[in-house]
Protein backbone atom coordinates (compact mmCIF):
# COMPACT_ATOMS: atom_id res chain seq x y z
CA UNK A 1 0.00 0.00 0.00
CA UNK A 2 1.29 3.51 -0.73
CA UNK A 3 2.41 5.60 2.24
CA UNK A 4 -0.24 7.78 3.91
CA UNK A 5 -0.58 11.32 2.59
CA UNK A 6 -0.18 14.19 5.03
CA UNK A 7 -0.18 17.13 2.58
CA UNK A 8 -1.56 17.76 -0.91
CA UNK A 9 0.06 20.23 -3.34
CA UNK A 10 -3.42 21.22 -4.56
CA UNK A 11 -4.49 22.18 -1.01
CA UNK A 12 -1.39 23.49 0.79
CA UNK A 13 -3.50 24.78 3.70
CA UNK A 14 -5.01 21.35 4.42
CA UNK A 15 -3.36 18.70 6.60
CA UNK A 16 -4.40 15.17 7.41
CA UNK A 17 -5.01 14.63 11.13
CA UNK A 18 -5.67 11.54 13.22
CA UNK A 19 -5.81 11.70 17.01
CA UNK A 20 -6.00 9.23 19.89
CA UNK A 21 -8.77 10.67 22.07
CA UNK A 22 -9.11 9.58 25.68
CA UNK A 23 -12.43 7.83 26.26
CA UNK A 24 -14.19 6.04 29.06
CA UNK A 25 -15.13 2.63 27.71
CA UNK A 26 -17.88 0.52 29.27
CA UNK A 27 -16.93 -3.15 29.27
CA UNK A 28 -19.97 -5.34 29.80
CA UNK A 29 -21.15 -8.92 29.64
CA UNK A 30 -24.66 -10.34 29.99
CA UNK A 31 -25.47 -10.95 33.68
CA UNK A 32 -22.31 -9.26 34.93
CA UNK A 33 -21.55 -5.84 36.39
CA UNK A 34 -20.13 -3.51 33.73
CA UNK A 35 -16.80 -1.80 34.33
CA UNK A 36 -15.64 1.60 33.13
CA UNK A 37 -12.05 1.70 31.89
CA UNK A 38 -9.87 4.42 30.45
CA UNK A 39 -9.03 3.80 26.81
CA UNK A 40 -8.45 5.70 23.61
CA UNK A 41 -10.34 5.93 20.33
CA UNK A 42 -8.93 7.02 16.98
CA UNK A 43 -10.62 9.90 15.22
CA UNK A 44 -9.55 12.04 12.28
CA UNK A 45 -9.65 13.23 8.71
CA UNK A 46 -7.22 11.54 6.39
CA UNK A 47 -6.89 12.23 2.66
CA UNK A 48 -8.63 10.25 -0.04
CA UNK A 49 -8.88 10.76 -3.78
CA UNK A 50 -10.25 9.08 -6.86
CA UNK A 51 -9.06 9.73 -10.42
CA UNK A 52 -11.35 8.51 -13.24
CA UNK A 53 -10.90 5.02 -14.64
CA UNK A 54 -10.55 4.06 -18.28
CA UNK A 55 -11.44 0.74 -19.88
CA UNK A 56 -9.40 -1.09 -20.94
CA UNK A 57 -7.28 0.34 -18.16
CA UNK A 58 -4.15 2.19 -19.32
CA UNK A 59 -2.60 2.51 -15.87
CA UNK A 60 -3.24 1.38 -12.32
CA UNK A 61 -6.50 2.75 -10.97
CA UNK A 62 -5.64 5.99 -9.19
CA UNK A 63 -7.69 5.58 -6.06
CA UNK A 64 -6.23 6.37 -2.65
CA UNK A 65 -7.90 6.07 0.72
CA UNK A 66 -6.39 6.63 4.16
CA UNK A 67 -8.33 6.06 7.36
CA UNK A 68 -7.67 7.02 10.98
CA UNK A 69 -7.02 3.79 12.87
CA UNK A 70 -4.88 2.33 15.65
CA UNK A 71 -1.17 2.33 14.83
CA UNK A 72 -0.33 0.49 18.04
CA UNK A 73 -2.55 -1.36 20.45
CA UNK A 74 -2.39 -4.21 22.94
CA UNK A 75 -4.93 -6.56 24.48
CA UNK A 76 -5.62 -6.55 28.22
CA UNK A 77 -7.80 -8.63 30.51
CA UNK A 78 -10.70 -6.95 32.31
CA UNK A 79 -12.44 -9.11 34.93
CA UNK A 80 -16.16 -8.53 35.50
CA UNK A 81 -18.02 -9.70 38.60
CA UNK A 82 -21.20 -11.66 37.91
CA UNK A 83 -23.32 -11.71 41.10
CA UNK A 84 -26.04 -14.34 41.17
CA UNK A 85 -24.08 -16.60 38.81
CA UNK A 86 -22.70 -19.12 41.27
CA UNK A 87 -21.22 -21.37 38.60
CA UNK A 88 -19.62 -18.39 36.78
CA UNK A 89 -18.93 -15.76 39.48
CA UNK A 90 -16.70 -13.76 37.14
CA UNK A 91 -15.95 -13.35 33.43
CA UNK A 92 -12.64 -12.30 31.89
CA UNK A 93 -13.07 -10.01 28.92
CA UNK A 94 -10.24 -9.08 26.58
CA UNK A 95 -10.07 -5.41 25.67
CA UNK A 96 -8.00 -3.79 22.95
CA UNK A 97 -6.13 -0.85 24.48
CA UNK A 98 -5.24 1.68 21.79
CA UNK A 99 -1.85 3.34 22.32
CA UNK A 100 -1.72 5.69 19.33
CA UNK A 101 -3.36 6.29 15.98
CA UNK A 102 -2.36 7.29 12.45
CA UNK A 103 -3.71 7.66 8.93
CA UNK A 104 -3.23 4.29 7.24
CA UNK A 105 -4.39 2.69 4.00
CA UNK A 106 -8.09 1.88 4.34
CA UNK A 107 -7.64 -1.85 3.76
CA UNK A 108 -5.14 -2.03 6.62
CA UNK A 109 -5.59 -2.08 10.37
CA UNK A 110 -3.78 -1.55 13.75
CA UNK A 111 -0.56 -2.93 15.22
CA UNK A 112 -0.14 -4.77 18.50
CA UNK A 113 2.69 -5.21 20.95
CA UNK A 114 5.56 -7.49 19.99
CA UNK A 115 5.03 -11.20 19.68
CA UNK B 1 -23.51 1.29 5.75
CA UNK B 2 -24.13 4.21 8.12
CA UNK B 3 -24.59 7.64 6.49
CA UNK B 4 -21.44 9.68 5.89
CA UNK B 5 -20.41 12.01 8.70
CA UNK B 6 -20.09 15.70 7.93
CA UNK B 7 -19.61 17.06 11.46
CA UNK B 8 -18.34 15.67 14.76
CA UNK B 9 -19.51 17.03 18.13
CA UNK B 10 -15.98 16.54 19.49
CA UNK B 11 -14.52 18.78 16.78
CA UNK B 12 -17.13 21.43 15.97
CA UNK B 13 -14.62 23.44 13.92
CA UNK B 14 -13.84 20.52 11.60
CA UNK B 15 -15.92 19.61 8.55
CA UNK B 16 -15.62 16.78 6.12
CA UNK B 17 -14.95 17.98 2.57
CA UNK B 18 -14.84 16.23 -0.79
CA UNK B 19 -14.46 18.17 -4.02
CA UNK B 20 -14.64 17.45 -7.73
CA UNK B 21 -11.52 19.12 -9.18
CA UNK B 22 -11.25 19.84 -12.90
CA UNK B 23 -8.38 17.92 -14.48
CA UNK B 24 -6.97 17.30 -17.93
CA UNK B 25 -6.86 13.54 -18.41
CA UNK B 26 -4.60 11.84 -20.96
CA UNK B 27 -6.35 8.86 -22.54
CA UNK B 28 -3.87 6.51 -24.19
CA UNK B 29 -3.52 3.04 -25.66
CA UNK B 30 -0.43 1.20 -26.85
CA UNK B 31 0.33 2.10 -30.50
CA UNK B 32 -2.34 4.81 -30.64
CA UNK B 33 -2.28 8.60 -30.43
CA UNK B 34 -3.20 9.81 -26.95
CA UNK B 35 -6.01 12.31 -26.45
CA UNK B 36 -6.43 14.98 -23.77
CA UNK B 37 -9.92 15.33 -22.33
CA UNK B 38 -11.47 17.47 -19.63
CA UNK B 39 -12.57 15.46 -16.61
CA UNK B 40 -12.86 15.68 -12.85
CA UNK B 41 -11.14 13.92 -9.96
CA UNK B 42 -12.43 13.53 -6.42
CA UNK B 43 -10.26 14.77 -3.58
CA UNK B 44 -11.00 15.37 0.08
CA UNK B 45 -10.83 14.66 3.78
CA UNK B 46 -13.67 12.59 5.15
CA UNK B 47 -14.08 11.46 8.75
CA UNK B 48 -12.98 8.09 10.09
CA UNK B 49 -12.83 6.66 13.57
CA UNK B 50 -12.04 3.43 15.38
CA UNK B 51 -13.24 2.47 18.87
CA UNK B 52 -11.40 -0.40 20.64
CA UNK B 53 -12.54 -4.01 20.22
CA UNK B 54 -13.48 -6.37 23.03
CA UNK B 55 -13.49 -10.18 23.13
CA UNK B 56 -15.96 -11.74 23.32
CA UNK B 57 -17.50 -8.83 21.43
CA UNK B 58 -20.26 -7.05 23.37
CA UNK B 59 -21.43 -4.91 20.46
CA UNK B 60 -20.75 -4.44 16.78
CA UNK B 61 -17.21 -3.27 16.10
CA UNK B 62 -17.31 0.56 16.18
CA UNK B 63 -15.22 1.35 13.13
CA UNK B 64 -16.28 4.01 10.63
CA UNK B 65 -14.52 5.06 7.47
CA UNK B 66 -15.67 7.52 4.81
CA UNK B 67 -13.73 8.17 1.63
CA UNK B 68 -13.98 10.86 -1.07
CA UNK B 69 -15.25 9.13 -4.18
CA UNK B 70 -17.49 9.71 -7.19
CA UNK B 71 -21.14 10.17 -6.20
CA UNK B 72 -22.21 10.36 -9.82
CA UNK B 73 -20.29 9.40 -12.91
CA UNK B 74 -20.95 8.11 -16.41
CA UNK B 75 -18.91 6.24 -18.98
CA UNK B 76 -18.11 7.92 -22.30
CA UNK B 77 -16.45 6.55 -25.41
CA UNK B 78 -13.21 8.22 -26.53
CA UNK B 79 -11.94 7.07 -29.93
CA UNK B 80 -8.18 6.99 -30.43
CA UNK B 81 -6.49 6.90 -33.82
CA UNK B 82 -3.89 4.17 -34.26
CA UNK B 83 -1.74 4.98 -37.31
CA UNK B 84 0.31 2.07 -38.63
CA UNK B 85 -2.22 -0.46 -37.28
CA UNK B 86 -4.04 -1.29 -40.52
CA UNK B 87 -6.05 -4.10 -38.97
CA UNK B 88 -7.00 -1.90 -35.96
CA UNK B 89 -6.99 1.71 -37.25
CA UNK B 90 -8.79 3.01 -34.17
CA UNK B 91 -9.53 1.93 -30.63
CA UNK B 92 -12.55 2.88 -28.52
CA UNK B 93 -11.72 3.50 -24.88
CA UNK B 94 -14.33 3.89 -22.18
CA UNK B 95 -13.61 6.79 -19.86
CA UNK B 96 -15.31 7.41 -16.53
CA UNK B 97 -16.53 11.00 -16.50
CA UNK B 98 -16.97 12.11 -12.89
CA UNK B 99 -19.92 14.47 -12.36
CA UNK B 100 -19.67 15.06 -8.63
CA UNK B 101 -18.07 13.62 -5.52
CA UNK B 102 -18.99 12.97 -1.90
CA UNK B 103 -17.80 11.28 1.28
CA UNK B 104 -19.08 7.69 1.20
CA UNK B 105 -18.42 4.47 3.11
CA UNK B 106 -14.90 3.26 2.24
CA UNK B 107 -15.88 -0.18 0.98
CA UNK B 108 -18.63 1.18 -1.28
CA UNK B 109 -18.43 0.81 -5.05
CA UNK B 110 -18.98 4.11 -6.86
CA UNK B 111 -22.27 4.44 -8.76
CA UNK B 112 -22.20 4.74 -12.56
CA UNK B 113 -24.81 5.81 -15.06
CA UNK B 114 -25.30 3.65 -18.13
CA UNK B 115 -23.65 4.50 -21.44
Amino acid sequence: APPPINKLALFPDKSAWCEAKNITQIVGHSGCEAKSIQNRACLGQCFSYSVPNTFPQSTESLVHCDSCMPAQSMWEIVTLECPGHEEVPRVDKLVEKIVHCSCQACGKEPSHEGL
Amino acid sequence: APPPINKLALFPDKSAWCEAKNITQIVGHSGCEAKSIQNRACLGQCFSYSVPNTFPQSTESLVHCDSCMPAQSMWEIVTLECPGHEEVPRVDKLVEKIVHCSCQACGKEPSHEGL
Epitope: W75, E96, L115 | -
Partner: antibody, heavy 118, light 112 residues
Protein backbone atom coordinates in the same frame (compact mmCIF):
# COMPACT_ATOMS: atom_id res chain seq x y z
CA UNK C 1 -19.26 -11.58 10.09
CA UNK C 2 -15.67 -12.68 10.72
CA UNK C 3 -14.35 -14.96 7.97
CA UNK C 4 -10.98 -16.55 7.25
CA UNK C 5 -11.01 -18.03 3.75
CA UNK C 6 -8.07 -20.22 2.75
CA UNK C 7 -6.76 -21.18 -0.67
CA UNK C 8 -7.57 -24.55 -2.23
CA UNK C 9 -5.96 -27.98 -1.87
CA UNK C 10 -2.46 -28.52 -3.27
CA UNK C 11 -0.53 -31.57 -4.44
CA UNK C 12 3.24 -31.16 -4.36
CA UNK C 13 6.33 -33.24 -5.05
CA UNK C 14 8.96 -33.82 -2.35
CA UNK C 15 11.48 -30.95 -2.28
CA UNK C 16 8.98 -28.43 -3.65
CA UNK C 17 7.42 -25.46 -1.84
CA UNK C 18 3.81 -24.58 -1.12
CA UNK C 19 2.25 -21.21 -0.36
CA UNK C 20 -1.13 -21.19 1.37
CA UNK C 21 -3.17 -17.99 1.65
CA UNK C 22 -5.72 -16.92 4.25
CA UNK C 23 -7.96 -13.95 3.43
CA UNK C 24 -9.51 -12.22 6.42
CA UNK C 25 -12.73 -10.20 6.38
CA UNK C 26 -15.32 -8.84 8.79
CA UNK C 27 -12.86 -7.38 11.30
CA UNK C 28 -9.91 -5.03 11.69
CA UNK C 29 -7.16 -7.14 10.12
CA UNK C 30 -4.27 -5.87 12.18
CA UNK C 31 -6.02 -5.87 15.55
CA UNK C 32 -5.46 -9.63 15.71
CA UNK C 33 -2.44 -11.87 15.29
CA UNK C 34 -2.67 -14.79 12.87
CA UNK C 35 -1.47 -18.29 13.75
CA UNK C 36 -0.84 -21.28 11.51
CA UNK C 37 -1.63 -24.75 12.84
CA UNK C 38 -1.40 -28.02 10.94
CA UNK C 39 -2.96 -31.44 11.33
CA UNK C 40 -1.54 -34.58 9.70
CA UNK C 41 -4.12 -37.23 8.70
CA UNK C 42 -5.59 -38.85 11.84
CA UNK C 43 -3.25 -36.82 14.08
CA UNK C 44 -3.54 -33.95 16.53
CA UNK C 45 -2.98 -30.23 16.13
CA UNK C 46 0.54 -28.85 15.71
CA UNK C 47 1.36 -25.15 16.08
CA UNK C 48 3.64 -23.77 13.36
CA UNK C 49 3.98 -20.06 14.02
CA UNK C 50 2.43 -16.63 14.34
CA UNK C 51 2.49 -13.34 12.44
CA UNK C 52 1.56 -9.85 13.57
CA UNK C 53 -0.25 -8.49 10.47
CA UNK C 54 0.52 -4.92 11.42
CA UNK C 55 4.29 -4.87 11.57
CA UNK C 56 4.80 -8.23 9.91
CA UNK C 57 6.89 -9.64 12.77
CA UNK C 58 6.85 -13.42 13.09
CA UNK C 59 7.70 -16.24 15.48
CA UNK C 60 8.05 -19.83 14.31
CA UNK C 61 8.14 -23.19 16.07
CA UNK C 62 11.71 -24.52 16.21
CA UNK C 63 10.70 -27.55 14.14
CA UNK C 64 9.84 -25.35 11.13
CA UNK C 65 12.58 -22.75 11.53
CA UNK C 66 14.33 -22.21 8.19
CA UNK C 67 11.55 -23.92 6.20
CA UNK C 68 8.53 -21.75 6.95
CA UNK C 69 7.89 -18.12 6.01
CA UNK C 70 4.80 -16.20 7.06
CA UNK C 71 3.96 -12.93 5.34
CA UNK C 72 0.98 -10.63 5.02
CA UNK C 73 -0.52 -8.15 2.58
CA UNK C 74 -2.42 -5.48 4.49
CA UNK C 75 -3.97 -4.01 1.33
CA UNK C 76 -5.87 -7.28 0.76
CA UNK C 77 -6.09 -8.40 4.43
CA UNK C 78 -4.38 -11.66 3.51
CA UNK C 79 -1.72 -13.71 5.30
CA UNK C 80 0.46 -16.32 3.63
CA UNK C 81 2.32 -19.37 4.90
CA UNK C 82 5.05 -20.79 2.68
CA UNK C 83 6.65 -24.13 3.53
CA UNK C 84 9.70 -25.23 1.55
CA UNK C 85 11.68 -28.47 1.09
CA UNK C 86 8.47 -30.46 1.42
CA UNK C 87 8.57 -34.10 2.50
CA UNK C 88 5.85 -36.71 2.72
CA UNK C 89 5.38 -36.09 6.45
CA UNK C 90 4.27 -32.51 5.61
CA UNK C 91 1.06 -33.95 4.18
CA UNK C 92 -1.55 -32.28 6.39
CA UNK C 93 -4.42 -29.87 6.61
CA UNK C 94 -3.05 -26.37 7.28
CA UNK C 95 -5.23 -23.92 9.24
CA UNK C 96 -4.93 -20.19 9.81
CA UNK C 97 -6.50 -18.91 13.03
CA UNK C 98 -6.73 -15.38 14.43
CA UNK C 99 -6.06 -14.38 18.02
CA UNK C 100 -6.45 -11.17 20.03
CA UNK C 101 -2.87 -10.63 21.19
CA UNK C 102 -1.53 -13.47 23.38
CA UNK C 103 -5.00 -14.83 23.76
CA UNK C 104 -7.12 -17.63 22.28
CA UNK C 105 -7.54 -18.67 18.66
CA UNK C 106 -11.13 -17.56 18.28
CA UNK C 107 -11.74 -17.98 14.53
CA UNK C 108 -10.25 -20.61 12.23
CA UNK C 109 -10.04 -20.92 8.46
CA UNK C 110 -11.65 -23.90 6.75
CA UNK C 111 -8.25 -25.57 6.27
CA UNK C 112 -6.11 -26.33 3.21
CA UNK C 113 -5.07 -29.89 2.44
CA UNK C 114 -1.48 -30.12 1.21
CA UNK C 115 -0.50 -33.53 -0.14
CA UNK C 116 3.19 -34.29 -0.69
CA UNK C 117 3.68 -37.28 -2.93
CA UNK C 118 6.12 -38.39 -5.58
CA UNK D 1 8.68 -26.23 25.24
CA UNK D 2 5.66 -26.74 27.48
CA UNK D 3 4.41 -30.33 27.14
CA UNK D 4 0.63 -30.77 27.35
CA UNK D 5 -0.76 -34.18 28.35
CA UNK D 6 -4.43 -35.04 28.03
CA UNK D 7 -6.39 -37.96 29.44
CA UNK D 8 -8.20 -40.07 28.62
CA UNK D 9 -7.30 -40.65 24.99
CA UNK D 10 -10.83 -41.82 24.25
CA UNK D 11 -14.03 -41.17 26.17
CA UNK D 12 -17.21 -43.14 25.34
CA UNK D 13 -20.20 -41.26 26.80
CA UNK D 14 -23.92 -41.73 27.24
CA UNK D 15 -26.11 -38.77 26.19
CA UNK D 16 -27.37 -36.90 29.23
CA UNK D 17 -24.47 -38.12 31.39
CA UNK D 18 -21.55 -35.91 32.53
CA UNK D 19 -18.05 -36.15 31.04
CA UNK D 20 -14.68 -34.88 32.20
CA UNK D 21 -11.34 -34.42 30.40
CA UNK D 22 -8.04 -33.73 32.12
CA UNK D 23 -5.12 -31.66 30.82
CA UNK D 24 -1.72 -31.39 32.52
CA UNK D 25 1.12 -29.06 31.60
CA UNK D 26 4.83 -29.62 32.24
CA UNK D 27 5.12 -26.04 33.57
CA UNK D 28 2.69 -23.77 35.39
CA UNK D 29 0.40 -21.81 33.08
CA UNK D 30 -0.40 -19.29 35.82
CA UNK D 31 0.85 -15.89 34.65
CA UNK D 32 2.13 -13.32 37.14
CA UNK D 33 -1.09 -11.39 36.40
CA UNK D 34 -3.08 -14.17 38.09
CA UNK D 35 -4.61 -15.67 34.95
CA UNK D 36 -4.15 -19.19 33.59
CA UNK D 37 -3.22 -19.17 29.92
CA UNK D 38 -5.02 -22.39 29.00
CA UNK D 39 -7.64 -22.77 26.25
CA UNK D 40 -9.90 -25.65 25.20
CA UNK D 41 -10.93 -26.41 21.61
CA UNK D 42 -13.37 -28.87 20.06
CA UNK D 43 -12.87 -30.29 16.60
CA UNK D 44 -16.07 -31.87 15.33
CA UNK D 45 -15.75 -34.53 12.61
CA UNK D 46 -14.79 -32.97 9.27
CA UNK D 47 -14.65 -29.43 10.70
CA UNK D 48 -12.07 -26.86 11.78
CA UNK D 49 -11.39 -26.59 15.51
CA UNK D 50 -13.55 -24.16 17.49
CA UNK D 51 -12.79 -22.29 20.70
CA UNK D 52 -14.71 -23.47 23.77
CA UNK D 53 -12.90 -22.06 26.82
CA UNK D 54 -10.22 -19.40 27.19
CA UNK D 55 -8.06 -18.32 30.14
CA UNK D 56 -8.86 -21.59 31.89
CA UNK D 57 -12.51 -21.01 32.72
CA UNK D 58 -14.18 -18.49 30.37
CA UNK D 59 -16.71 -19.75 27.86
CA UNK D 60 -16.32 -18.33 24.34
CA UNK D 61 -19.29 -16.69 22.59
CA UNK D 62 -22.06 -19.11 21.71
CA UNK D 63 -20.68 -21.99 23.78
CA UNK D 64 -23.47 -23.74 25.75
CA UNK D 65 -23.28 -23.45 29.52
CA UNK D 66 -23.02 -27.22 29.91
CA UNK D 67 -19.31 -26.71 29.14
CA UNK D 68 -17.09 -25.47 31.96
CA UNK D 69 -13.36 -25.19 32.50
CA UNK D 70 -11.51 -25.23 35.81
CA UNK D 71 -8.05 -25.68 37.29
CA UNK D 72 -4.91 -23.66 37.87
CA UNK D 73 -1.17 -23.96 37.47
CA UNK D 74 -0.52 -27.33 35.85
CA UNK D 75 -3.84 -29.21 36.28
CA UNK D 76 -6.95 -28.33 34.27
CA UNK D 77 -10.30 -29.96 33.63
CA UNK D 78 -12.99 -29.56 31.01
CA UNK D 79 -16.41 -30.73 32.15
CA UNK D 80 -19.58 -31.34 30.15
CA UNK D 81 -22.49 -31.46 32.59
CA UNK D 82 -24.84 -33.37 30.26
CA UNK D 83 -23.37 -34.69 27.04
CA UNK D 84 -25.39 -34.18 23.86
CA UNK D 85 -24.96 -35.97 20.53
CA UNK D 86 -23.56 -32.79 18.95
CA UNK D 87 -20.67 -32.76 21.46
CA UNK D 88 -18.84 -35.63 19.74
CA UNK D 89 -15.41 -34.86 18.38
CA UNK D 90 -11.85 -34.41 19.55
CA UNK D 91 -11.16 -32.03 22.43
CA UNK D 92 -7.77 -30.31 22.68
CA UNK D 93 -6.21 -28.17 25.40
CA UNK D 94 -3.62 -25.56 24.37
CA UNK D 95 -1.27 -23.43 26.43
CA UNK D 96 -1.03 -19.77 25.44
CA UNK D 97 1.56 -18.71 28.01
CA UNK D 98 4.66 -19.29 25.93
CA UNK D 99 5.80 -19.44 22.32
CA UNK D 100 5.61 -22.01 20.84
CA UNK D 101 1.97 -22.64 21.63
CA UNK D 102 1.53 -26.35 22.34
CA UNK D 103 -1.52 -28.60 22.20
CA UNK D 104 -2.46 -31.69 24.13
CA UNK D 105 -2.73 -34.90 22.14
CA UNK D 106 -6.52 -34.73 22.08
CA UNK D 107 -9.40 -36.66 23.67
CA UNK D 108 -11.91 -38.32 21.38
CA UNK D 109 -15.44 -38.12 22.76
CA UNK D 110 -17.86 -40.58 21.19
CA UNK D 111 -21.38 -41.75 21.98
CA UNK D 112 -21.60 -45.24 23.50
Amino acid sequence: EVQLVQSGAEVKKPGASVKVSCKASGYTFTSYYMHWVRQAPGQGLEWMGIINPSGGSTSYAQKFQGRVTMTRDTSTSTVYMELSSLRSEDTAVYYCARAPGKFPLDYWGQGTLVTVSS
Amino acid sequence: DVVMTQSPLSLPVTPGEPASISCRSSQSLLHSNGYNYLDWYLQKPGQSPQLLIYLGSNRASGVPDRFSGSGSGTDFTLKISRVEAEDVGVYYCMQALQTPRTFGGGTKVEIK
